[in-house]
């Protein structure tokens, strides 16, 4: 039954609607016209519309679709690059603050060994930095570094003071004693394990917060193909050739349609799912050794039980040390006394209270929150993007894409749209390269994250003592595990009152330009009704 | 007594790739941070790269990352630069050095010099 | 360009003293230490000071440096004419993340 023919007869509302999108009218019909040119908006009678019209409505159909995308991702999309932002810039001052009480330390109890403590200090968090950024580096060598370069201060100015300042030439022995004679006893292998359980999950939730960005990047320009294209123009355009320009498309024929057009996009979301997931239980597992704020900011107080533990055996080093690097010294120096009161009896030693106000732990957890609504992000995308474009409410009086339609029906659309375009084609396509590579690196992070996530009954946790120290990490004489400080101390409280100093705002809703329209470029915006306002995030 | 000496410099044109080596001896090198610093003809010096004790960790200046790799052999107790890419301003002397933030011995240096 | 600054020359007569100034900022000297190297023409440099003010076994008393902010000095005491060398001043750059040096002094005895 042939459709009705153009209510104007003149082709001249099409032409004036198009006219928006492409200035000058030689490519407008002035009375309609058999149309036997046309690819996509296929008459049946005849049309107001030519080929390169249909050209133009293709372009402008992709440019709309990946501005609807773009506009779908925008909330997610802030949200994850704020909180990376964030999280990095809270990282850095925790390493900040965790350098200045160690600083702070060696000045209050250890003056003579500035300022090399504070170069030795200094590269050792520059290490922690670099690596929490993704640098190179071995945990176990910064550590490493750190007591070895240390103890040739500690002997030649606490335990040796009598020695020269060119002390260079017995470097060379002591950092040998150091390792040899375990001098920090089980300190060292103790930074060792709680600085690389703890940094290694940082370093992995930045990755994992960067990787998220990255993949709404990828989705978020996306070049759509010519197929898609096509079908887009055939469902917001091709009503215009035949006059009938504020008819909408029929809802159920939309998403029969944007599922073609996002077929690959939509094989992200397995992936995506197990993502969100795998990083809140990362984040869960984030405390005690697997929190960074918590051992770098608690670090001051393993060292300088460390010094205190050398100088305890002080004596006992001295001697055997005096003997190993006899050939490096010229004479036998006094060794420095210490009296028995310096050491603070392990029994009646306080752990410093920590208060939380806000800390890190609290904002990893908001985060999740907030990650997990958007959990149906890409299996919600062709939904979410008919819903913010103009379509029939109940599929009633509507576009099929060929003919306005009193009721949508699936079946006698994909009928009617066989001769014209294969739609299960454009499904067996499979995800373009650009999203397989994207697929592949959530595969891996996922893996890297799955890793790191232990078990909710770690065992690990049950061998900690209040300190966090691991069992097994302190030999049979307790004193190698002192876990509290001395005279001089810093207290460390409010431990993440310095998040104050954060420029940042992690609230959302306000992000800038959540209320835009899902619009195409001025120029384009009347072509396409009114898409409506992006309200409601992609949930 | 402590000694480093360089070997691997010579004339190679740009696009090109040279090693150099850096022997070691009269300390223990594998609890040593080694570095590579490089002086152009007539100007001043340049640090290029470091590595850590154990070779576990490694640093880069920004002119060079991702066309030099440092890397070290402690049973050998040899460090060494893998220049590739190299381009016309990498000519200069290169010299190892033993230390990463400061450089207390230095070897006599080789001259690499990148040329068409 | 130099991250930190040295005036390209300094003379003396024997017996005279030359301070040679290394001028940084927040972000080396200000935060870490200063090591002095000298440097004869033709061969390696060899390390005069390190830690701000402390000498290697084998460096003359003659050689003092010290550092006050983001600036640091090497004073040569009772110039020699061996004296006549490069100096150079180098310092990690916690921004860089890396050892900036002076472009280095010529030091001259007249």
């Known amino acids: 039954q042939p459709p009705p023919p153009p209510p104007d007869a003149t082709c001249h509302q099409v032409r004036s609607f198009f006219q928006r999108l492409q200035p000058g009218l030689k490519w407008v019909p002035e009375t309609p016209v058999p149309g036997s040119d046309l690819q996509v908006c296929l008459p049946k009678g005849p049309t107001c519309c030519s080929r390169k019209m249909e050209e133009k409505y293709q372009l402008t159909a992709r440019l709309n679709m990946e501005q609807l995308l773009q506009s779908a991702s925008m909330e997610l999309k802030f949200l994850i690059i704020q909180n990376a932002a964030v999280f990095q810039e809270a990282f850095e001052i925790v390493v900040r603050h965790a350098k200045n009480y160690t600083n702070a330390m060696f000045k209050n109890n250890y003056p003579s060994l500035t300022p090399q403590a504070f170069e030795f200090v200094g590269e050792f968090f520059t290490d922690v930095s670099l690596y929490i950024l993704g640098s190179d580096i071995n945990v176990d060598d910064m550590v490493n570094e750190l007591f070895d370069s240390l103890f040739p201060v500690i002997y030649t100015q606490l335990m040796n003071p009598g020695l020269p300042d060119s002390a260079l030439d017995i470097n060379e022995c002591l950092r040998g004693a150091r390792r040899d004679l375990k001098v920090f006893g089980n300190f060292p292998k103790l930074i060792m394990t709680q600085v690389s359980k703890s940094l290694q999950v940082t370093r992995i939730f930045l990755q994992a917060l960067n990787l998220g960005i990255e993949v709404i990047n990828t989705t978020d320009h996306l070049k759509f193909s010519k197929d898609c294209g096509r079908m887009l123009t055939r469902m917001w355009y091709c009503s215009y050739c035949q006059g009938l320009m504020m008819v909408k498309p029929c809802g159920g024929y939309c998403n029969v349609v944007m599922q073609g057009c996002m077929a690959g996009v939509v094989e992200i979301d397995k992936y995506w799912r197990e993502y969100i997931l795998s990083l809140e239980e990362l984040v869960n597992g984030m405390y005690r050794i697997y929190d960074m704020e918590n051992v770098l900011l608690g670090l001051f107080s393993t060292i300088h039980d460390s010094i205190q533990y050398v100088q305890k055996n002080a004596g006992k080093l001295t001697t055997t040390i005096g003997k190993l690097c006899a050939h490096s010294q010229q004479r036998q120096y006094r060794s420095a006394y210490y009296p028995e009161d310096l050491f603070i009896d392990k029994k009646v030693l306080k752990v410093a209270h920590v208060e939380h106000e806000e800390t890190l732990s609290s904002r990893r957890r908001e985060l999740i929150q907030k990650l997990k609504s958007f959990i149906s992000f890409y299996s919600a995308l062709p939904g979410y993007i008919c819903s913010h474009s103009p379509v029939a409410e109940n599929d009633t009086l509507c576009w099929n894409g060929q003919e306005l339609v009193e009721r949508y029906s699936q079946k006698a659309a994909r009928n009617g749209m066989k001769n014209q375009f294969n739609l299960h084609e454009l499904k067996m396509k499979g995800p373009e390269p650009v999203v397989s590579q994207i697929i592949d690196k959530l595969k891996h992070i996922n893996q890297l994250l799955r890793t790191m996530s232990m078990p909710k009954g770690r065992v690990l946790d049950k061998n900690l003592d209040e300190e966090g120290f691991e069992s097994g990490d302190c030999g049979d004489d307790e004193d190698e595990c002192i876990g509290g400080s001395g005279d001089g101390m810093i207290k460390v409280k409010n431990q993440l009152r310095f998040l104050a100093e954060l420029a940042y705002d992690l609230d959302v809703d306000d992000a800038p330009g959540n209320s835009q329209q899902a619009t195409p470029k001025d120029n384009e915006i009347s072509t396409f009704h009114n898409l409506g306002n992006v309200h409601s995030p992609l949930k | 007594e402590v000694q480093l000496l360089e070997s691997g410099g010579g004339l190679v044109q740009p696009g090109g790739s040279l090693r150099l080596s850096c022997a070691a001896s009269?300390?223990?090198?594998?609890?040593?941070?080694m570095s590579w610093v490089r002086q152009a003809p007539g100007k001043g010096l340049e640090w290029v790269s470091a590595?850590?004790?154990?070779?576990?960790?490694?640093y880069y200046a920004d002119s060079v990352k991702g066309r030099f790799t440092i890397s070290r052999d402690n049973s050998k107790n040899t460090l060494y630069l893998q220049m590739n890419s190299l381009r016309a301003e990498d000519t200069a002397v290169y010299y190892c050095?033993?230390?990463?933030?400061?450089?207390?011995?230095w070897g006599q240096g080789t001259m690499v010099t990148v040329s068409s | 360009s130099y991250e930190l600054t040295q005036p390209p020359s300094a003379s003396g007569t024997p017996g005279q003293r030359v301070t040679i100034s290394c001028s940084g900022g927040?972000?080396?000297?200000?935060?870490?230490?200063v090591n002095w190297f000298r440097q004869l023409p033709g061969t390696a440099p060899k390390l005069l000071v390190y830690?701000?003010?402390q000498r290697p076994s084998g460096v003359p008393d003659r050689f003092s440096g010290s550092k006050s902010g983001t600036s640091a000095s090497l004073a040569i005491g009772g110039l020699q004419s061996d004296d006549e060398a490069d100096y150079y001043c180098?310092?990690?750059?916690?921004?860089?993340?890396?050892?900036?040096f002076g472009g280095g002094t010529k030091v001259t005895v007249l």
């Open positions: 050095a033993r230390g990463k933030r400061y450089f207390d011995y």
């Open positions: 009269g300390f223990t090198f594998s609890s040593y941070a």
């Open positions: 590595i850590s004790g154990s070779g576990g960790s490694t």
């Open positions: 927040s972000s080396n000297i200000g935060s870490n230490t």
């Open positions: 830690f701000n003010n």
């Open positions: 180098v310092a990690w750059d916690d921004s860089l993340n890396a050892p900036v």
